[in-house]
Interface confidence: low
Amino acid sequence: WPPPGTGDIIVQAPTQVPGFLGDSVTLPCYLQVPGMEETHVSQLTWSRHGESGSMAVFHQTQGPNYSEPKRLEFVAARLGTELRDASLRMFGLRVEDEGNYTCLFVTFPQGSRSVDIWLRVLAKPQNTAEVQKVQLTGKPVPVARCVSTGGRPPAHITWHSDLGGMPNTSQAPGFLSGTVTVTSLWILVPSSQVDGKSVTCKVEHESFEKPQLLTVNLTVYYPPEVSISGYDNNWYLSQNEATLTCDARSNPEPTGYNWSTTMGPLPPFAVAQGAQLLIRPVDKPINTTFICNVTNALGARQAELTVQVKEGPPSEPSGMSSN
């Protein structure tokens, strides 16, 4: 016990210290001595709960001794100095280092003073996100994969998407013992509307200052979706040319466009130019259904459009509207 009327010495240390797997960490531990108080420290001792013996000792004449000399080091304690700082550095942090440690000062006249510190071992995960290229399966499949590798504790993965779908998240042991690899798949029914859109994987971990966002651009392979534009139902006999356009969306891109009519090949006044069909002026009314057939690596699809070229109304000059 200290002499009556004097302030006691206090061992100061955080209740919990975080450290990263494989890195070094300092367990801070200081002896606070009130201004008028006198104390003499003869030993600093570190031990771990549940283990016999001490893991590190600093003796005022013998200096330091460690159970694992390559992994432990007193940060500030030196022979010939006042032993007020017992802070201990641990190198190459392992999962099994997590636990409760006791820092103890052997002092005179106050006796021994100690404090407990909980060492928490963290591992900062590596995060990757990748697209899972798919076709139109008609059933839910993974379209994106987000992997948070080697986190301790496990990372928390969520998805942000305007496309619908649902996550499928699983955990497996990480490469380093005690770490966890979290794999999250974003699963939906693929459609052409999904192709080229993005989903965002959000990874949260206590080692991050802020959540990590990884955007994945989705790829859905689908056959062409075809429509024909350029006709407004108001084409009249005239000298002007008009154009129909075959609008196709597909992934991969279209490899070919083929124009025909329901009657077979194109009439002389219609000239195919890739995705466009040039309609030359005609001198008599026509009523023709044009077909545009579009091909890509996954197949062929077509669209039809019936075009009427009429005689101009009596009240106004006749003319094919130019598009």
Partner: antibody, heavy 116, light 107 residues
Framework: EVQLVQSGSELKKPGASVKVSCKTS????????MHWVRQPHGKGLEWIGG????????SYNQRFKGRVTITVDKSTSTAYMELSSLRSEDTAVYYC?????????WGQGTLVTVSS | DIQMTQSPSAMSASVGDRVTITCKAS??????VAWYQQKPGQPPKALIY???YRYSGVPDRFSGSGSGTDFTLTISSLQAEDLAEYFC?????????FGQGTKLEIK
């Protein structure tokens, strides 16, 4: 394109050591764990061990502990597997394989023959 | 160590057949199972991860299922190029272990 290119075939005498290399390209070497797996002719696959290139932390199959050493050279993005005290039953094709939870990329394999 | 027991060890099937290979783990491995295809003279190629998800580029005739201790690889309609040996692997705990393989021959 991810590539794992291994060193050529080796013929060793019993008791000797062998060191097989695996040069990687097409990805960031320090972001993935590299493992070694072997396959005796006509038989199954056996995991030997692995290494995290960033920290050099290793994990070995206890069956090989004491005989195997896995190392990396970050400057050349190359992994190495050294097996000592070779015996005839170590004759096998040795593969390096990148780990992503499963082994997604493999080297072409290195045949190690142990014979007197 | 977790044992992965594959069956059958060898089988013969005709083009177009539905083929099923099973793998039984000696203890619960969740869904931490992968399947590999190894063609003669080549390294293994990953087909399935997390027990049931195909790698990009793997034909959809290949499918995986199962969790816990019982796992299945199915080829819905066998093709000539599927001639290979197939392996399962658990990555639930060290040491990682593989099944002994199933050699698939085409009739």
């Amino acid at each position: 394109e991810v590539q794992l290119v291994q060193s050529g075939s080796e013929l060793k005498k019993p008791g000797a050591s062998v060191k097989v290399s695996c040069k990687t390209s097409g990805y960031t070497f320090t972001e993935y764990t590299m493992h070694w797996v072997r396959q005796p002719h006509g038989k199954g696959l056996e995991w030997i061990g692995g290494i995290h290139p960033n920290q050099g932390e290793t994990s070995y199959n206890q069956r090989f502990k004491g005989r195997v050493t896995i190392t990396v050279d970050k400057s050349t993005s190359t992994a190495y597997m050294e097996l000592s005290s070779l015996r005839s039953e170590d004759t096998a094709v040795y593969y390096c394989a990148r780990w992503t939870g499963d082994f997604d990329y493999w080297g072409q394999g290195t045949l190690v023959t142990v014979s007197s | 160590d977790i044992q992965m027991t594959q069956s059958p060890s060898a089988m013969s099937a005709s083009v177009g057949d539905r083929v099923t290979i099973t793998c039984k783990a000696s203890q619960n491995v969740g869904t931490n199972v992968a399947w590999y295809q190894q063609k003669p003279g080549q390294p293994p190629k990953a087909l399935i991860y997390s027990a049931s998800y195909r790698y990009s580029g793997v034909p959809d005739r290949f499918s995986g299922s199962g969790s816990g201790t019982d796992f299945t690889l199915t080829i819905s309609s066998l093709q000539a190029e599927d001639l290979a040996e197939y392996f399962c692997q658990q990555y639930e705990s060290y040491p990682y272990t593989f099944g002994q393989g199933t050699k698939l021959e085409i009739k």
